[in-house]
Amino acid sequence: EEELQMIQPEKLLLVTVGKTATLHCTVTSLLPVGPVLWFRGVGPGRELIYNQKEGHFPRVTTVSDLTKRNNMDFSIRISSITPADVGTYYCVKFRKGSPENVEFKSGPGTEMALGAKPS
């Protein structure tokens, strides 16, 4: 069985205020079963950006249809970028656990930084 890898191809993503940013994340295996979440930052203070399981994230949309049973693309789009959105974003695979899911593997992260202002 192939070991799951979390692939975030861009180390740095330059974004423009007011525009939409696409953060890429693909997995190489669907196992173990469990959700993929997006965070900004690391450690106990990290900010949840998107949870495929539950929650309301009005500025976030998924690139792919996550309800496909064979989906391996967990990329997201964040709309209406502001300076407050800069930081490093991680897609993180959790394996199922009781009572809480357990963090299984994290992607290497994508740093989002502001590029040149639109002219």
């Epitope: 669907l30 196992l31 079963v33 249809d65 996550l66 309800t67 496909k68 064979n70 989906n71 009572p99």
Partner: antibody
Framework: DVQLVESGGGVVRPGESLRLSCAAS????????MSWVRQAPGKGLEWLAG????????YYIDSVKGRFTISRDNSKNSLYLQMNSLTAEDTAVYYC???????????WGLGTLVTVSS | ALTQPASVSANPGETVKITCSGG??????YGWYQQKSPGSAPVTVI????KRPSDIPSRFSGSASGSAATLTITGVRVEDEAVYYC???????????FGAGTTLTVL
């Protein structure tokens, strides 16, 4: 409130076809995967097929693959099951069910009865 | 195939456990569905191993460990009499499977 209402059941002869519908309301239909489950008389529940929210991805149990087709029309908030080459073994109550994020079920319809008899 | 006992019985107020075995913990999520009479609409009592819908009483709980899942009814009531089906979603095959059902009789 989430509501799923199946229709289209009835009595057909072996070899004939039938199309079941499931009308959904009370939730954003286009955001959820859906499934069909059946129950033959005196038997247990049997999952038949599931379809992704966008409708491009479908899976079937082996016994209906090639005979049944699951589809959906998100503009009409409707799920369908096209059943061809029906046999007596397909006699059952057919339920539509909304899927959770991990392809289990949270809401069910009341079911529609399909009887295949000569 | 998922295996569950054909029947269990209990007195009101007792704790009932129904097991469902045959899935692979690494690749399977479990759910539990209550059907009060044949042909009536099933009701989801547990999904995602241990998640209880908001309208289901707290006496229903679920757990999963190894190759088995367990539905526990703590302080069973007469109205809990029903057939309980376990189901699994296998992330390896993308297929759902139901157990044969367990008839719960409250004496």
């Amino acid at each position: 409130d989430v509501q799923l209402v199946e229709s289209g059941g009835g009595v057909v002869r072996p070899g004939e076809s039938l199309r079941l519908s499931c009308a959904a309301s009370g939730f954003t239909f286009s955001s959820y995967a859906m499934s069909w489950v059946r129950q033959a008389p005196g038997k247990g529940l049997e999952w038949l097929a599931g379809i992704s929210a966008g409708g491009s991805d479908a899976y079937y149990i082996d016994s209906v693959k090639g005979r049944f087709t699951i589809s959906r029309d998100n503009s009409k908030n409707s799920l369908y099951l096209q059943m061809n080459s029906l046999t007596a073994e397909d006699t059952a109550v057919y339920y539509c069910a909304r899927e959770t994020w991990n392809h289990l079920f949270d809401y069910w319809g009341l079911g529609t009865l399909v009887t295949v008899s000569s | 195939a998922l295996t569950q006992p054909a029947s269990v019985s209990a007195n009101p107020g007792e704790t009932v456990k129904i097991t469902c075995s045959g899935g692979d913990w690494y690749s399977t999520y479990y759910g539990w569905y209550q059907q009060k009479s044949p042909g009536s609409a099933p009701v989801t009592v547990i999904h995602s191993d241990d998640k209880r819908p908001s309208d289901i009483p707290s006496r229903f709980s679920g757990s999963a460990s190894g190759s088995a899942a367990t539905l526990t009814i703590t302080g069973v009531r007469v109205e809990d009499e029903a057939v309980y089906y376990c189901a699994g979603y296998d992330g390896r095959t993308y297929i759902n499977t139901f157990g044969a059902g367990t008839t719960l009789t409250v004496l």
